[in-house]
């Protein structure tokens, strides 16, 4: 016998479905309606036939009572080709649910998303995560998706984007967004970052993650942030191949005084980069290629400095300078 595609845990908390058959029995996912965390992976299927079975234009209020009874707070949908009209239909219905966190991964969205009807209510998400999602509409996808969401989104994560730059003139501000994660977009680069950080559309950002995004220098990132008026408290530039030196012709960039935590781990640095903020609470330089202990004049004024995993700390080589704050644990770099 073939294994059941869905599994609901004994606490009715987490339900995972992996549909791999060419013609899956979607009714198997019904057991997930009592779960808080739901994951549905559609095995790369094209969901176009669903449009024939559902009336995408039907008034979603007729499902409101049923949807309100759903316990789902976190939903992940992955591995499918989804008509935009079907996605919109799902968002309209889920607007009546208690859903707070939505993750879309390995999806191909086909067609264009219709505008939000006047009487429709947006989905009140706190977190939206997208990984390897392609949109037929190119750069305008975020603006089209945004109109189906209420303005309270706090966390936005976009990884492996086919079009990480947005059509900024169409995007509305995200007034509550405190965390923006653009990690794992290796083709983004500093110019792409300028295009993605639509000026004054992200006024509340506190945490900005740019791991593995093709960033080249902290100064270049500083310039992109300044141009966009983005002033994060915490900035993660780890897993980028960073250059320590600054192009002499590049203008000096003043970091926002709001920035107090900077992660430069796994960045291939052989020396402390120039142009860092003058004062930081946390600076992570672990797992780089520093051959000697940084001198005090090379470092910002910092409360919590991590240097673990650099060659100069490996037993048998140079000792760390006094006052460097290391955990004593050698990380797996």
């Amino acid at each position: 016998t073939t294994p059941e595609p869905c599994e609901l845990d004994d606490e009715d908390f987490r339900c995972v479905c992996n549909f791999s058959e060419p013609q899956p029995d979607w009714s198997e996912a019904f057991q997930c309606v009592s779960a808080v965390e739901v994951e549905i992976h559609a095995g790369g299927l094209n969901l176009e036939p669903f449009l024939k079975r559902v009336d995408a234009d039907a008034d979603p209020r007729q499902y409101a009572d049923t949807v309100k009874a759903l316990r789902v707070r976190r939903l992940t949908v992955g591995a499918a080709q989804v008509p935009a009209q079907l996605l919109v239909g799902a968002l309209r219905v889920l607007a009546y649910s208690r859903l707070k966190e939505l993750t879309l991964e390995d999806l191909k969205i086909t067609g264009t998303m219709p505008p939000l009807p006047l009487e429709a209510t947006g989905l009140a998400l706190s977190s939206l995560r997208l990984r390897n999602v392609s949109w037929a509409t190119g750069r305008s996808w975020l603006a089209e998706l945004q109109q189906w969401l209420k303005p309270g989104l706090k966390v936005l994560s976009i990884a492996q984007a086919h079009s990480p730059a947005f059509s900024c003139e169409q995007v509305r501000a995200f007034p509550a967004l405190t965390s923006l994660d653009l990690s794992d977009n290796p083709g983004l680069g500093e110019r792409g970052l300028m295009a993605a950080l639509c000026p004054h559309k992200f006024p509340a950002i506190q945490n900005l993650a740019l791991r593995n995004t093709g960033m080249e220098t902290p100064t270049g990132v500083c310039a992109a942030l300044a141009a966009a008026g983005v002033q994060p408290h915490s900035l993660d530039l780890s897993h980028n191949s960073l250059r320590a030196t600054v192009n002499p012709s590049a203008p000096r960039c003043m970091w926002s005084s709001a920035l107090n935590s900077l992660n430069l781990s796994f960045a291939g640095l052989e020396q402390v980069p120039k142009g860092l903020p003058a004062k930081l609470r946390v600076l992570d330089l672990s797992c780089n290629r520093l051959n000697r202990a940084p001198q005090p004049d090379e470092l910002p004024e910092v409360d919590n400095l991590t240097l673990d995993g650099n060659p100069f700390l490996v037993p048998g080589t140079a000792l760390p300078h006094e006052g460097s704050m290391n955990s004593g644990v050698v990380p797996a770099c």
């Epitope: 845990d9 004994d10 606490e11 057991q31 009874a69 759903l70």
Partner: nanobody
Framework: QVQLQESGGGLVQAGGSLRLSCAAS????????MGWYRQPPGKEREMVAQ???????NYGDSVKGRFTISRGSARNTVYLQMNNLKPEDTAVYYC?????????WGQGTQVTVSS
């Protein structure tokens, strides 16, 4: 191990009604989703009706408006009220309890609708 016992099947005239019951026994520590499925002669097994642990119901297209699934007051008991029966409803009806690791199925009860 969980056992499911269906009852209430039989022979009925078209347009008539039947009520199927299913009782689960064994090691079940929480209310689980349950469902009714059927296998008409020479055909694949198909979903008839489902009910979640929080009372949400779902029906197969061919039985909507005629069949009603409900839970009993006992922890994992489920009923299927079948009205306006048609000859194409003839099948063996199985009860299913969705359970982590391995779902449990009953032995089935025969429903025959004569025209």
């Amino acid at each position: 191990q969980v056992q499911l016992q269906e009852s209430g099947g039989g022979l009925v005239q078209a347009g008539g009604s039947l009520r199927l019951s299913c009782a689960a026994s064994g090691r079940i520590f929480s209310i689980r989703p349950m469902g009714w499925y059927r296998q008409p002669p020479g055909k694949e097994r198909e979903m008839v009706a489902q009910i979640s642990s929080n009372g949400i119901t779902n029906y197969g297209d061919s039985v909507k408006g005629r069949f009603t699934i409900s839970r009993g007051s006992a922890r994992n008991t489920v009923y299927l009220q079948m009205n306006n029966l048609k000859p194409e409803d003839t099948a063996v009806y199985y009860c299913r309890l969705f359970k982590t690791g391995a779902d449990s199925w009953g032995q089935g009860t025969q429903v025959t609708v004569s025209s």
